[in-house]
């Protein structure tokens, strides 16, 4: 058993690179990384996705992209990525590192994820060895990282298969480590040269300071110039720690993503690692074997690097890798003012009072199937219903017998009489009208409006609301 550890040192535009990817985001962003380990170096052995394990980093610091400014290295998450392995460390493996960007804008559906870069590296690595440094190009991006595999006690050895247990664990004091295989003692780790960079240097013998790839100097504090040191051929320069370029079409290694360059007459040819293709291995050929579909997505096609894959996403997710959650509530599925709740596995509508159904589509207050009693008529409006009751009845459903005189409808002392068709007001002297609301002038001229055609003043008048009236 043991742990594979990956330390990302930097991620940013490569020399001469002008990646467009980071400038497509609309708001603040942050990076995170996914590491995937596959056993073996051969095409066949690499078939299974992440069989040795995978890990996701924490999110990095939030940054805001500025399209006008030159792109700096992007801020990274803190800490190591650790992939525990239970069994023996295989020694040969494929390392896949994906750089993801999370957009934190207020877009629908919460943060959106997009894959910025993917690098693949086939390596031989013994467990318990020093950090191995690497610089990889992915399109216009450059990723600098170091990695190692270490055994977890009591496992030791290059494959973490040998066990080492001192008889008395207490004999190994602070700063000491358990015995070498098959021996019963404790040994101190080597002490590196004083001042040796903790981040970029390491030692296997006391007093030495060996640098991770990309760093130089006696204490590993000096970054190697990337523009002149990336994959160049030729003799080593002791002054810079860089390789002096030699002539040829493979100078500077035009093959991205770990591709190896071989010269052809007047040109070059890239041999691409699995998962990449194109003239310069710049095209990511992720296949279904890499398990690219997140959130329950089904990978369709893409059985080999020459055929593209498609992720069929479950409802609720979208994006080329089903990495983005859909805000299904943005489609406003809940009717009649219902509140939409996306529970992930299902959509729920919390309905306003008076409505029901999965989408609040049923109006409990509508007139369908609702009878107003005693000859009342159902009237809809404003998402509710009411009964317009026949005279002499009232209440929500016209079931209550109403006393039309209870509200004292007759003005100026008129007396109210209940009648089969409503009420009748007997007006006090000097007043007239359906509710005794009009005074009669002393000169005998009525203050009533002009009589409707066909009616003479003084005739009993029937008003549109069908209440009889008498004037005295």
């Amino acid at each position: 058993a043991g742990v594979f550890e990956l330390q990302i040192h930097s991620f940013g535009p490569g020399p001469g690179g002008a990646p467009r990817s980071p400038y497509s985001a609309r708001g603040p962003c942050r990076l995170f990384f996914r590491v995937c380990l596959k056993p073996g170096l051969s095409e066949e052995a690499a078939e299974s996705p992440c069989a040795l394990g995978a890990a996701l980093s924490a999110r990095g610091p939030v940054y805001t992209e500025q399209p006008e400014a030159p792109a700096p290295d992007l801020p990274l998450p803190n800490g190591l990525l650790q992939v525990p392995f239970r069994d023996a460390w295989p020694g040969t493996f494929s390392l896949i590192i994906e750089t993801w960007r999370e957009e934190l804008g207020d877009q629908i559906g919460g943060p959106a994820w997009s894959l910025l870069a993917r690098v693949t590296r086939r390596r031989r690595l013994a467990a318990g060895g020093p950090w191995a440094g690497d610089i990889q190009r992915a399109g216009a991006w450059e990723l600098r990282f170091s990695y190692r595999a270490r055994c977890e006690l009591p496992a030791v050895g290059t494959a973490c298969t040998r066990l080492c247990r001192p008889r008395s664990a207490s004999r190994c004091g602070p700063g000491l480590r358990p015995c070498a295989p098959l021996e019963d003692e404790c040994e101190a780790p080597p002490v590196c040269r004083a001042g040796c960079s903790l981040e970029h240097g390491f030692c296997e013998q006391p007093g030495e300071c060996r640098c991770l790839e990309g760093w130089t100097g006696p204490l590993c504090m000096v970054p190697v110039s990337t523009s002149s040191c990336l994959g160049l051929r030729g003799p080593s320069s002791t002054t810079t720690g860089c390789l002096v370029p030699g002539p040829g079409p493979c100078d500077g290694n035009p093959c991205a993503n770990g591709g190896s360059c071989s010269e052809t007459p007047g040109s070059f040819e890239c041999t691409c690692p699995r998962g990449f293709y194109g003239l310069r291995c710049e095209v990511s050929g992720v296949t279904c074997a890499d398990g690219p579909c997140f959130n329950g997505g089904l990978c369709v096609g893409g059985a080999d690097p020459d055929s593209a894959y498609i992720c069929h996403c479950p409802p609720g997710f979208q994006g080329s890798n089903c990495e983005k959650r859909v805000d299904r509530c943005s489609l406003q599925p809940c009717r009649n003012g219902g509140l939409c709740l996306d529970l992930g596995h299902a959509l729920r509508c919390r309905c306003r009072a008076g409505f029901a159904g999965p989408r609040c589509e049923h109006d409990l207050n509508d007139c369908a199937g609702r009878a107003c009693a005693n000859g009342g008529t159902c009237v809809e409006g404003g998402g509710a219903h009411r009964c317009s009751c026949a005279l002499g009845f009232g209440g929500r459903d016209c079931r209550e017998r109403a006393d039309p005189c209870a509200a004292r409808p007759c003005a100026h002392g008129g007396r109210c009489y209940a009648h089969f068709s409503g009420l009748v007001c007997a007006c006090a002297p000097g007043y007239m009208g359906a509710r005794c609301e009009f005074p009669v002038h002393p000169d005998g001229v009525s203050a009533l409006p002009a009589a409707p055609p066909g009616l003479r003043p003084g005739d009993p008048q029937r008003y549109p609301h069908h209440h009889h009236h008498h004037h005295h």
Epitope: A289, N295, G296, P314, P358
Partner: antibody, heavy 118, light 108 residues
């Protein structure tokens, strides 16, 4: 609760086209993917394909040339057509719902036995 | 396509015993996109486990799933009479969706 009901002929002549319909109750057909699976007598399960209301389909490559699926959202139904049938297509045909957290089948119809014989 | 091989083909046990059913995939199933179903004679299959280890709604806790990569296991901790049936595993990470050939669990 959600229910699925297969319907179609129980007997089809070889070389003809089998047409089956699955009627979905108590859930909107546009909220899930829907699938057909078959099981020959005494044998295991074989996935035929699935469809989404948007028109997205995915068929088993072994049957792809003969399969067509469609969906009718107004009737809350989806359908399977299997052409050029032979006796080897004799099976119980199930319709099923694909779950919303991955392509596993969380609700099944009771199945309909279809025999191909002249 | 991913081929799923179930073992044993038939398992004879008594009620109260523990049943362990195996499903091996020809390739790694990403993100443990594996499900288990129970089928009784004349009935449709019923989903028991999804995501290799998550119990479906209404499934008793005597059913449990485990495994990752290419090796998956369905365990029934204490067999009840109604548990005797045929069990299928299914992968849903890579199209075409495929099922195992089934394990028949019968009363000893």
């Amino acid at each position: 609760q959600v229910q699925l009901q297969e319907s179609g002929p129980g007997l089809v002549k070889p070389s003809e086209t089998l047409s089956l319909t699955c009627t979905v109750s108590n859930v909107s057909i546009s909220s899930y993917y829907w699938s057909w699976i078959r099981q020959p007598p005494g044998k295991g399960l074989e996935w035929i394909g699935y469809i989404y209301y948007s028109g997205t389909t995915n068929y088993n490559p072994s049957l792809k040339s003969r399969v067509t699926m469609s969906v009718d959202t107004s009737k809350n139904q989806f359908s399977l057509k299997l052409s050029s049938v032979t006796a080897a297509d004799t099976a119980v045909y199930f319709c099923a719902r694909l779950s919303n957290w991955g392509f596993a089948f969380d609700i099944w119809g009771q199945g309909t036995m279809v025999t191909f014989s002249s | 396509e991913i081929v799923l091989t179930q073992s044993p083909g038939t398992l004879s046990l008594s009620p109260g015993e523990r049943a362990t059913l195996s499903c091996r995939a020809s390739q790694t199933i990403s993100s443990s996109y594996l499900a288990w179903y129970q089928q009784k004679p004349g009935q449709a299959p019923r989903l028991l486990i999804y995501g290799a280890s998550s119990r479906a709604t209404g499934i008793p806790d005597r059913f449990s799933g485990s495994g990752s990569g290419t090796e998956f296991t369905l365990t029934i901790s204490r067999l009840e009479p109604e548990d005797f049936a045929v069990y299928y595993c299914q992968q849903y990470g890579w199209s075409p969706i495929t099922f195992g050939q089934g394990t028949r669990l019968e009363i000893k």
